[in-house]
Amino acid sequence: KETAFVEVVLFESSPSGDYTTYTTGLTGRFSRAGATLSAEGEIVQMHPLGLCNNNDEEDLYEYGWVGVVKLEQPELDPKPCLTVLGKAKRAVQRGATAVIFDVSENPEAIDQLNQGSEDPLKRPVVYVKGADAIKLMNIVNKQKVARARIQHRPPRQPTEYFDM
């Protein structure tokens, strides 16, 4: 279970037409349900129930987005339409280049994602929790255009101070 380094850029447009950016990072884990590779795309929040819809025509996005799914407490959805792995597959079928699950409310999902599959997805399936999950949901709740870049090694930072 390797660390996934997620870099997020929020785009803030101004009335004059130009924009500023806000860049941040968070860490998650690559699950065995998907591939440990880099991916990049615009963040699209998906409701877990929204992934139940079988009509793929209805909900197709352009290929190359990063799906963000906040999993609910299992008690709130005792008979889910799809397993967590099934939800990841459905998102990838709809064009997600990667899926990030917030597992804070449903930590059992970690085991489900890491059980190992005969046929793992060819795209990364990442899970986040704690402060990283709060940050991710705060990004989504800003309702701004945001792009995520998922990497399996940390991006080099110019802000580290080395005490010689």
Partner: antibody, heavy 118, light 107 residues
């Protein structure tokens, strides 16, 4: 209880650089949160200066972009503010805080007064 | 940048009184508004986040409300420790900005 403590010189000469350190205890600066510098001018005006994320990304207030730098030393659990070419207008109480654009400022240092004067 | 205007800038009040502080933004905030209290000794603590959510340890006499560009902080029954400066702060749009502060003082 998470604590933040600012330190640095209380007096800086105009045109010089202001350098402050924020030492964090009972939380690690790589724990997922963002860490900010905020200043309060005489007369109560408050200004967010910039932040550094748990992953080391920095964001600055556009009004200070060309003069400011925020760095960190994860081994000492500290982050730093450097403000260049200061003028008397930069005299303020400087606070470090946990939080930023993506988190409310939940923990604050006690503040350190910096006066810019020759 | 979003401009935050607080009113009044000074508010004389008595113990046990109910007071309301207002905060108006130059753009819609979608509830991305926080409140802070600065004590006379300079220490700052968070009170509410996302308009109406109490930070842990904050007494229930504090409450927040609002939408769009207009928000308010209400203290239902003033305690001696409530006399301080209150700031609103938006994080709807980058960079985060603060209101000018409201000084709550003993009448």
């Amino acid at each position: 209880e998470i604590q933040l403590q600012e330190s640095g010189p209380g007096l800086v000469k105009p045109s010089q650089s202001l350098s402050l350190t924020c030492s964090v205890t009972d939380d690690t600066i790589t724990s997922g949160y963002d860490w900010s510098w905020i200043r309060k001018f005489p007369g109560n005006k408050m200004e967010w200066m910039g932040d550094i994320s748990s992953s080391g990304h920095t964001n600055y207030n556009p009004s200070l972009q060309i003069r400011i730098s925020i760095t960190r030393d994860t081994s000492k659990n500290q982050f730093f503010l450097q403000l260049n070419s200061v003028t008397t207008e930069d005299s303020a109480t400087y606070y470090c805080a946990r939080g930023g654009f993506l988190f409310p400022f939940t923990f604050w240092g006690q503040g350190t007064l910096v006066t810019v004067s020759s | 940048d979003i401009q935050m205007t607080q009113s009044p800038s000074s508010l004389p009040a008595s113990l046990g009184e109910r007071v309301t502080i207002s905060c108006r933004a130059s753009q819609v905030l979608n509830n991305n508004l926080n409140w802070y209290q600065q004590k006379p000794d300079g220490t700052i603590k968070p009170l509410l986040y996302y308009t109406s959510n109490l930070q842990s340890g904050v007494p229930s006499r504090f409450s927040g409300s609002g939408s769009g560009t207009d928000y308010s902080l209400t203290i239902t029954s003033l305690d001696p420790e409530d006399f301080a400066i209150y700031y609103c702060q938006q994080d709807a749009s980058f960079p985060p900005t603060f209101g000018g502060g409201t000084k709550l003082e003993l009448k």
